[in-house]
C-alpha cells in the first residue's frame, strides 16, 4: 500500500497586494497521526505559517474546516497579502511524537505579490536655468512587483528618448524602485509646458500612472529691453519708456539711471502675460530737461530673478 | 458505510488466531484501522493501529505479540502467543485518534484464550 | 504511558438531569486536546460522541458537549434522555503515537 502523499496542485499562485492568497493542500491518508503545518522558506530558516495542532495564526484561515472527520483539504487563506509575503510555500505533514517529526512535505507553491507602483514623483532642477540650456529631471516610483515595469517621458505629448533608466534592486527582493532621469532643452516657449513621467505596470491594467513637472518652475526666459523718447509732453520735459519684454518669471526690479546716478527704482506690478507666458512690463520716466545744460545718458537696469542686471541705456540731446 | 469482523473462537493459551475487519461503503487505503479490545465485564483498551504503507503502532503490552496489516479493504489482526487474559471481544475501529477519531466501529468478535 | 482517571465511576440520575463526567490525564494530552468520548451500551459496539475534547461528532444530539485542555476534561449531557444511560469512556492520547488509553469508563444508570 502506498503511502501518505502531499499533493500541493499549484506550482504558482499571484495575487494583488491586499487581497487573500488560497495555497492548496491536500493529503491522501489520515494516517500517520499528526498535524500539517506551512512553511515559507525551506531549510532551518523556514518560517512557520500555520499549525494544525497549535498556536495563534491571525491572517490564516482554513478553506476546509480542519476539524470535520475526514478532512485531508489543509489549503488556507492567508489575508491582507503584502510584497513580503512573496516566496515558496510548503505544506508539511508531521508525525506525532515528542516532538513532531516531519514525515512528508508538499513540493511547493511559490507565491508572487502584484504590487503597484506608488505615484511617480518627477523633480527637476534646484536652480532655474534659462533657454537652449539642457537640465536633467528625475522621477521615481517603488513599492512594485514583479518586477517588469516600462517607464516613459514625454514633454507636451513628445515622447523624449534622451533618459536612462535604473530599476532596484538587481537581484530577487519583495519589491522594487525604479528611478529614470531625462534630459531636456528648454526653449523660449517653455513655460506653459510640461514634463511627463509616465509608469506602466501589469498591476496597472494599461491604465497607467503619471508624475508630473511644470516647466514654469525650472526655466527663466531673461527679458529684452528696449529705451524709447517719446515726443516732448511739455516745453521742458520728456517721456522716455523702458519695455521689458518676454520674461519669466515676473520677479524683476527695474532702476532708472540719469548720467550713473539712480533717479527711480521699481518693482514689475501690472504686467501682461503673453500667450507663451511669458511678461512683458513698461516704465517710464519724465526728464526735466531744462535742469541739463549736457546731453544726458539715460539708463534702464533691469535685476530679473536675483540675476545679473542686464541694461539699455538713451542718449537724450538736450539742445542749446 | 461498516466493518464486519471475523476470525474470533476459542484458542489454547500458546495459540495464534487472525482476526479480520472487512469494509464497506468506503475504502481503508486512506483511512487507519484501530483495534481495541474489551475483556468480559472490564472496561475498552487500544490494542494497536494499522496506517498505510506499513505505518503501524501497538500498545506497548502488544508489541511483538499482535501484528497489524490492511488492504484497500480489508484490515487484520494476528494474535500470537495468547494468553488467558487476552480473553476478549476485539473491535475493530475507522480511525487513528487525535483529529481522526474511532468513528465506525464493527461488531466485535469474541476471543477466548482457555485450555 | 498516559494514565487517564474518569469521575465519577458511575452516576444515577434521571431523565432531564445535566450530567457531567470529568477525566484527568496523567500529563498533558497531545496538542492540549487529544481527547475523545464514546458511550457504549450493554452487547453493542462503543459510539463516537466528541473529539478534539469539544468537536461534536456528526449525528450526535447537540445535548451533549465537552470541553477542557490539556489534563482535565469534561463531558456533559445537558437534559438526560431516556437513551442515554449507558457507559462513557474518554480516550486520550499522549505525544506518543503508541500512546493511547481510555479511562475506567463511567456507568450512567436509571434513579
Known amino acids: 500500500e502506498e503511502e501518505l502523499q502531499v499533493i500541493q496542485p499549484d506550482k504558482s499562485v499571484s495575487v494583488a497586494a491586499g487581497e487573500s492568497a488560497i495555497l492548496h493542500c491536500t493529503v491522501t491518508s489520515l494516517i500517520p497521526v499528526g498535524p500539517i503545518q506551512w512553511f515559507r522558506g525551506a531549510g532551518p530558516a523556514r518560517e512557520l505559517i500555520y499549525n494544525q495542532k497549535e498556536g495563534h495564526f491571525p491572517r490564516v484561515t482554513t478553506v476546509s474546516e480542519s476539524t470535520k472527520r475526514e478532512n485531508m483539504d489543509f489549503s488556507i487563506s492567508i489575508s491582507n497579502i503584502t510584497p513580503a509575503d512573496a516566496g515558496t510555500y510548503y505544506c508539511v505533514k508531521f508525525r506525532k511524537g515528542s516532538p513532531d517529526t516531519e514525515f512528508k512535505s508538499g513540493a511547493g507553491t511559490e507565491l508572487s505579490v502584484r504590487a503597484k507602483p506608488s505615484a511617480p514623483v518627477v523633480s527637476g532642477p534646484a536652480a532655474r536655468a534659462t533657454p537652449q540650456h539642457t537640465v536633467s529631471f528625475t522621477c521615481e516610483s517603488h513599492g512594485f512587483s514583479p518586477r517588469d515595469i516600462t517607464l516613459k517621458w514625454f514633454k507636451n505629448g513628445n515622447e523624449l528618448s534622451d533618459f536612462q533608466t535604473n530599476v532596484d534592486p538587481v537581484g530577487e527582493s519583495v519589491s522594487y524602485s525604479i528611478h529614470s532621469t531625462a534630459k531636456v532643452v528648454l526653449t523660449r516657449e517653455d513655460v506653459h509646458s510640461q514634463v511627463i513621467c509616465e509608469v506602466a505596470h501589469v498591476t496597472l491594467q494599461g491604465d497607467p500612472l503619471r508624475g508630473t513637472a511644470n516647466l514654469s518652475e525650472t526655466i527663466r526666459v531673461p527679458p529684452t529691453l528696449e529705451v524709447t523718447q517719446q515726443p516732448v509732453r511739455a516745453e521742458n520735459q520728456v517721456n522716455v519708456t523702458c519695455q521689458v519684454r518676454k520674461f519669466y518669471p515676473q520677479r524683476l526690479q527695474l532702476t532708472w539711471l540719469e548720467n550713473g546716478n539712480v533717479s527711480r527704482t521699481e518693482t514689475a506690478s501690472t504686467v501682461t502675460e503673453n500667450k507663451d507666458g511669458t511678461y512683458n512690463w513698461m516704465s517710464w520716466l519724465l526728464v526735466n530737461v531744462s535742469a541739463h545744460r549736457d546731453d544726458v545718458k539715460l539708463t534702464c537696469q533691469v535685476e530679473h530673478d536675483g540675476q545679473p542686471a542686464v541694461s539699455k541705456s538713451h542718449d537724450l540731446k538736450v539742445s542749446a | 458505510r461498516q466493518l464486519v469482523e471475523s476470525g474470533g473462537g476459542l484458542v489454547q493459551p500458546g495459540g495464534s488466531l487472525r482476526l479480520s475487519c472487512a469494509a464497506s461503503g468506503f475504502s481503508l487505503s486512506s483511512h487507519g484501522i484501530s483495534w481495541v479490545r474489551q475483556a468480559p465485564g472490564k472496561g475498552l483498551e487500544w490494542v494497536g493501529t494499522?496506517?498505510?504503507?506499513?505505518i503501524t503502532y501497538y500498545a506497548s503490552w502488544a508489541k511483538g505479540r499482535f501484528t497489524g496489516s490492511k488492504t484497500s479493504s480489508t484490515a487484520y489482526m494476528e494474535l500470537s502467543s495468547l494468553r488467558a487474559e487476552d480473553t476478549a471481544v476485539y473491535y475493530c475501529?475507522?480511525?487513528?485518534?487525535?483529529?481522526?477519531?474511532?468513528?465506525?466501529w464493527g461488531q466485535g468478535t469474541l476471543v477466548t484464550v482457555s485450555s | 504511558d498516559i494514565v487517564m482517571t474518569q469521575s465519577p465511576s458511575s452516576l444515577s440520575a434521571s431523565v432531564g438531569d445535566r450530567v457531567t463526567i470529568t477525566c484527568q490525564a496523567s500529563?498533558?494530552?497531545?496538542?492540549?486536546?487529544?481527547l475523545a468520548w464514546y458511550q457504549q451500551k450493554p452487547g453493542q459496539a462503543p459510539k463516537l460522541l466528541i473529539y478534539?475534547?469539544?468537536t461534536l461528532a456528526t449525528g450526535v444530539p447537540s445535548r451533549f458537549s465537552g470541553s477542557g485542555s490539556g489534563t482535565d476534561f469534561t463531558l456533559t449531557i445537558s437534559s438526560l434522555q431516556p437513551e442515554d444511560f449507558a457507559t462513557y469512556y474518554c480516550l486520550g492520547g499522549g505525544d506518543d503515537e503508541a500512546d493511547n488509553t481510555f479511562g475506567q469508563g463511567t456507568k450512567v444508570e436509571i434513579k
Open positions: 494499522i496506517g498505510t504503507g506499513g
Open positions: 475501529a475507522r480511525g487513528s485518534a487525535w483529529n481522526d477519531p474511532f468513528d465506525i
Open positions: 500529563q498533558s494530552v497531545y496538542g492540549n486536546n487529544d
Open positions: 478534539l475534547a469539544s
